[in-house]
């Protein structure tokens, strides 16, 4: 019987884009590949696997504004920038099965109109796979 | 004879807290969870598996002090901040077995008081499963 | 028949060094180890595998210089400095089979002198195994 | 000119709850600490709660863990204390206070008061 | 839990020296903070790490800590000190205890 090296099982990440957030919402997120381990729903990444997580997130803003990026109701939020324009950062954080994260946005101006984003870019990738996974 | 797809054995990583620094000596740290699959000891964090690490710190200190993150004697230091009243960084770097991961700590005060930490966190995954790890 | 834990393949992962970068070209880049699991060619990393990767670039100029790392032909960089005697930054960026990763630097002195570096050091390291890889 | 105003103190009954809101002006929101702090009639100040700046580390004292909660909302510049399961030992002006180094409280707002009574 | 003891009164006569202390076990290995409130108003930071004054505070305002008191000093007290004052630490589990507060009269 010949012994075949083992395949690593596909590692729990996603990159969804941003174009566009809504003051006092959030950030409208696509997911443009069809082959994501990670799923967005209602706006939100869905956490399935506990564990650490790097979490990148790029983007520049048409006006000034506060941004957070949040992961579960009455926790802090994974980012925080206040009156920015532009963002990119770099973080890691411990999520958990249940765990959904999304944005949260209040621009600064009279206007409500929405935010256009250049280059809107959050990645997520798991960092420790063998942990529980809930599917 | 039924394949499973293999599992991930799991990932050298720890999350330890740290509440307070001595004065010209390091951070008390602490591991919260039993589980983690890696130790402290003599208030270090042991390095069994060589490879590339994702190293994540943050904290905010009662009073302005310089820290390093230290790995092995003779060695410069993974991070060095001087003269900063908090601390949020990420950085990559090559450890290797019987590498300790400590702090190094000395407040510019005149007191010799301990310094106290809110939100102290340091953060090690280990970025190259399948390399050599010694237990 | 006793069961053995798979053990992971190799991760894609190197470091790299530049201690001299030419103006209007690139950095040259070596290898330190023969160990690493991804090859340099023509001054450039070759990229295997399909994923997102973690990059950290680290390093002191000798002199003021604008400095961007690519990675394909018609693509924005995946860094861009503009007039900098150092840098020490991580990035996230999803990479494919066929990239390549290469200096361009600027300087800004009339002299066409190459530019010293002290501390250069670039590492890749793949986020997904598991996925698309040719070797 | 930094100014936090403190708002959503009322007269309640025992086991209900309040949401207190304080907005921060005048300063960068982000970068500070929060805390409350409370006073009741005649008595001198006790800590109730604090969230660094980033938001990473929540601490309570003893006597609300369980039944107050401290926020922040960093778009609105607003901190929040919200309160369940009231007592009428829970009567007390509540103060928000910011601190730029977690230690301190530089800055306070002048306060509202919650009476917890039937 | 940590617990600090002030006296609840002190009196001091005009332009003399008010001394206002704060007991706890071995509270001169912690960070203390002082802190006026006058009447009907909000508490105002005076003295941070036991001796510093933040700015556009006065000079006769000084603090000094060792073994287990610390002690806020008023050199040349004005009827505007008239106040009660407390001192505060952060416990070991980062919860901020304060002091049961002295009140300064001034004659």
């Known amino acids: 019987l010949q012994q075949v090296p083992p395949q690593y099982p596909p590692i729990q990440s996603i990159r969804v884009q941003f174009t566009r957030c809504e003051n006092e919402k959030g950030c409208i997120i696509t997911s443009p590949s069809k082959d994501e381990t990670m799923k967005v729903q209602d706006n939100s990444i869905i956490i399935n696997c506990d564990g650490f997580y790097l979490i990148s997130l790029k983007g520049y803003f048409s006006e000034e504004l506060s941004l957070s990026l949040y992961y579960r109701k009455g926790r802090g939020p994974l980012f925080s920038l206040s009156k920015v324009t532009s963002v990119d950062s770099i973080g890691v954080a411990y999520l958990a099965f249940k765990d959904k994260v999304y944005f949260n946005v209040t621009t600064h101006s009279t206007s409500y109109k929405d935010i256009q984003v250049n280059g809107g870019e959050l990645i997520l990738i798991h960092q420790n796979p063998g942990g529980f996974c809930a599917y | 004879l039924q394949q499973v797809p293999p599992q991930y054995p799991p990932i050298q990583s720890i999350r330890v807290q740290f509440t307070r620094c001595e004065n010209e000596k390091g951070c008390i740290i602490t591991s919260p969870s039993k589980d983690e699959t890696m130790k402290v000891q003599d208030n270090s964090i042991i390095i069994n598996c060589d490879g590339f690490y994702l190293i994540s710190l943050k904290g905010y200190f009662s009073e302005e002090l310089s820290l390093s993150l230290y790995y092995r004697k003779g060695r410069g230091p993974l991070f060095s901040l001087s003269k900063v009243t908090s601390v949020d960084s990420i950085g990559v770097a090559y450890l290797a077995f019987k590498d300790k991961v400590y702090f190094n700590v000395t407040t510019h005060s005149t007191s010799y008081k301990d310094i106290q930490v809110n939100g102290g966190e340091l953060i090690l995954i280990h970025q190259n499963p399948g390399g050599f790890c010694a237990y | 028949l006793q069961q053995v834990p798979p053990q992971y393949p190799p991760i894609q992962s190197i470091r790299v060094q530049f201690t001299r970068c030419e103006n209007e070209k690139g950095c040259i880049i070596t290898s330190p180890s023969k160990d690493e699991t991804m090859k340099v060619q023509d001054n450039s990393i070759i990229i295997n595998c399909d994923g997102f990767y973690l990059i950290s670039l680290k390093g002191y100029f000798s002199e003021e210089l604008s400095l961007s790392l690519y990675y394909r032909k018609g693509r924005g960089p995946l860094f861009s400095l503009s007039k900098v005697t150092s840098v020490d930054s991580i990035g996230v960026a999803y990479l494919a089979f066929k990239d390549k990763v290469y200096f361009n630097v600027t300087t800004h002195s009339t002299s066409y002198k190459d530019i010293q570096v002290n501390g250069g050091e670039l590492i890749l390291i793949h986020q997904n195994p598991g996925g698309f890889c040719a070797y | 000119e930094v100014q936090l105003v403190e708002s959503g103190g009322d007269l309640v009954r025992p086991g209900g709850s309040l949401r207190l809101s304080c907005v921060a002006s005048?300063?960068?929101?982000?970068?500070?600490?929060m805390s409350w702090v409370r006073q009741a009639p005649g008595k001198g100040l006790q800590w109730v709660a604090l969230i660094n700046s980033g938001g990473s580390s929540i601490t309570y004292a003893d006597v609300v863990r369980g039944r107050f909660t401290i926020s922040r909302d960093y778009a609105k510049n607003t901190l929040y204390l919200q309160m369940n399961s009231l007592r009428a030992e829970d009567t007390a002006v509540y103060y928000c206070?910011?601190?730029?180094?977690?230690?301190?409280?530089?800055?306070w707002g002048q306060g509202t008061r919650v009476t917890v009574s039937s | 839990s940590f617990v600090l003891t002030q006296l609840p009164s002190v009196s001091v006569t005009l332009r003399q020296t008010a001394r206002i202390t704060c007991g706890g076990d071995i509270i001169g290995s912690k960070n203390v903070y002082w802190y006026q409130q006058r009447l009907g108003q909000a508490p105002v930071l005076i003295i941070y790490r036991d001796s510093n004054r933040p700015t556009g505070i006065p000079e006769r305002f000084s603090g000094a800590s060792s073994g287990n008191t610390a002690t806020l000093t008023i050199s040349g007290a004005l009827a505007e000190d008239e106040a009660d004052y407390y001192c505060q630490v952060w416990d070991n589990s980062n919860k901020a205890m304060f002091g049961g507060g002295t009140h300064l009269t001034v004659l």
């Open positions: 005048g300063i960068t929101f982000s970068s500070y600490h």
């Open positions: 206070a910011s601190g730029s180094i977690w230690t301190h409280f530089d800055y």
